[in-house]
Amino acid sequence: LPAQVAFTPYAPEPGSTCRLREYYDQTAQMCCSKCSPGQHAKVFCTKTSDTVCDSCEDSTYTQLWNWVPECLSCGSRCSSDQVETQACTREQNRICTCRPGWYCALSKQEGCRLCAPLRKCRPGFGVARPGTETSDVVCKPCAPGTFSNTTSSTDICRPHQICNVVAIPGNASMDAVCTSTSPTRSMAPGAVHLPQPVSTRSQHTQPTPEPSTAPSTSFLLPMGPSPPAEGSTGD
């Protein structure tokens, strides 16, 4: 004979676990249905009735199978130094990342909480380590024989041009000036500009922290029946 299929809610046998997409309700002491992503538990199960699920309201979401009593609030709108890379839906939170020219100074589980403008190396200094999505530019003084005459988050120190006859010697912030005879440019390895980091932003506005930082359902646990493990042990 085929095994009898238990319909939720049901009392699990000793040492057995609730099935996938079910949870053990500590109050009812039964295995009950979870709610699908985009829904939440409107009414918890009892000995005789299963979980009643309802859709998340606008600007709220649940990302996982769950039995949270309320959907999570989506994070607030992305600030001016950010761009929305994932919209708020009933099944996922809004994700904000930093604009070009900015990096993430304070990350959150997904996206960025606080963006900051990439450091610009002033004349006499070049980029030692370029900025990334999550780290600032590192500047270094131009070594003898190199210079940078720009204020830039991407320019490295470049070698002075080599003159047949030097009119004005170069320094850290200025190239050598040659007399009218054509200069011989030293062979500098690589390009003059470093590539921009993948997620960089405009350099005008100050960074503003995102006020709302709702956690994702992957670590939000309901304060109700029991923890949302996919298969909870139940008797």
């Epitope: 049901y10 009392a11 000995k47 029991s226 923890p227």
Partner: antibody, heavy 115, light 111 residues
Framework: QVQLVQSGSELKKPGASVKVSCKAS????????MSWVRQAPGQGLEWMGW????????TYAQGFTGRFVFSLDTSVSTAYLQISSLKAEDTAVYFC????????WGQGTLVTVSS | DIVLTQSPDSLAVSLGERATINCRAS??????????MHWYQQKPGQPPKLLIY???NLESGVPDRFSGSGSRTDFTLTISSLQAEDVAVYYC?????????FGGGTKVEIK
């Protein structure tokens, strides 16, 4: 296998407090609630209430409000029963019992209140 | 809360004879195809030991001379052939309601 190990016997004076511990092993502590049961000398079993081991929310049976507090330390899979302002009539064996449809029991902790 | 009334209070049975203990609930303990009545054995100085769960299911490791029956409000624990080691107090317990309750206990002795 499921095991509930309780702290040892206590002898207390009236008015004092006592804290009984119940350490769980062999299962995920936060999946099942924990009940507390009292058995006075020569008497039957008396359900005191339970605590949701996930949320930490306690429920107390009639007659066990006020002086009785259930608490948890989930980091060490342990439930606690604290009784304050002890009276002679609190002398009993206190059991923790894992709350499923039926119980798995601790070995019991004898609390004696005597002047 | 649900009240469980156990009878008799005590019971003396000859070795090898049948022992029957009853437990009546003040309201139905049956829901979702289960009766949430459980039976425990307690010996002096020991915690209660589960014998029967959900009215009629024999707990692993418990001798099959123990059996449980009943539904809704009336339940019975039967020891088909009493052994010396069965001398103990037996309790019924309900988990139909959020608040558990126990019966008053039945002391089983050898006649």
């Amino acid at each position: 296998q499921v095991q509930l190990v309780q702290s040892g016997s206590e002898l207390k004076k009236p008015g004092a407090s006592v804290k009984v511990s119940c350490k769980a092993s062999g299962y995920t502590f936060t999946t099942f609630g924990m009940s507390w049961v009292r058995q006075a000398p020569g008497q039957g079993l008396e359900w005191m209430g339970w605590i949701n081991t996930y949320s930490g929310v306690p429920t107390y049976a009639q007659g066990f409000t006020g002086r009785f507090v259930f608490s948890l330390d989930t980091s060490v899979s342990t439930a606690y029963l604290q009784i304050s302002s002890l009276k002679a009539e609190d002398t009993a064996v206190y059991f923790c019992a894992r709350r499923s449809n039926f119980a798995y029991w601790g070995q019991g902790t004898l609390v004696t209140v005597s002047s | 809360d649900i009240v469980l009334t156990q009878s008799p209070d005590s019971l003396a049975v000859s070795l090898g004879e049948r022992a029957t203990i009853n437990c009546r609930a003040s309201e139905s303990l049956t829901a979702s195809g289960n009766s949430f009545m459980h039976w425990y054995q307690q010996k002096p100085g020991q915690p209660p030991k589960l014998l029967i769960y959900r009215a009629s299911n024999l707990e692993s490791g418990v001798p099959d001379r123990f059996s449980g029956s009943g539904s809704r409000t009336d339940f019975t624990l039967t020891i088909s052939s009493l052994q010396a080691e069965d001398v103990a107090v037996y309790y019924c317990q309900q988990s139909r309601h959020v608040n558990w309750t126990f019966g008053g206990g039945t002391k089983v002795e050898i006649k």
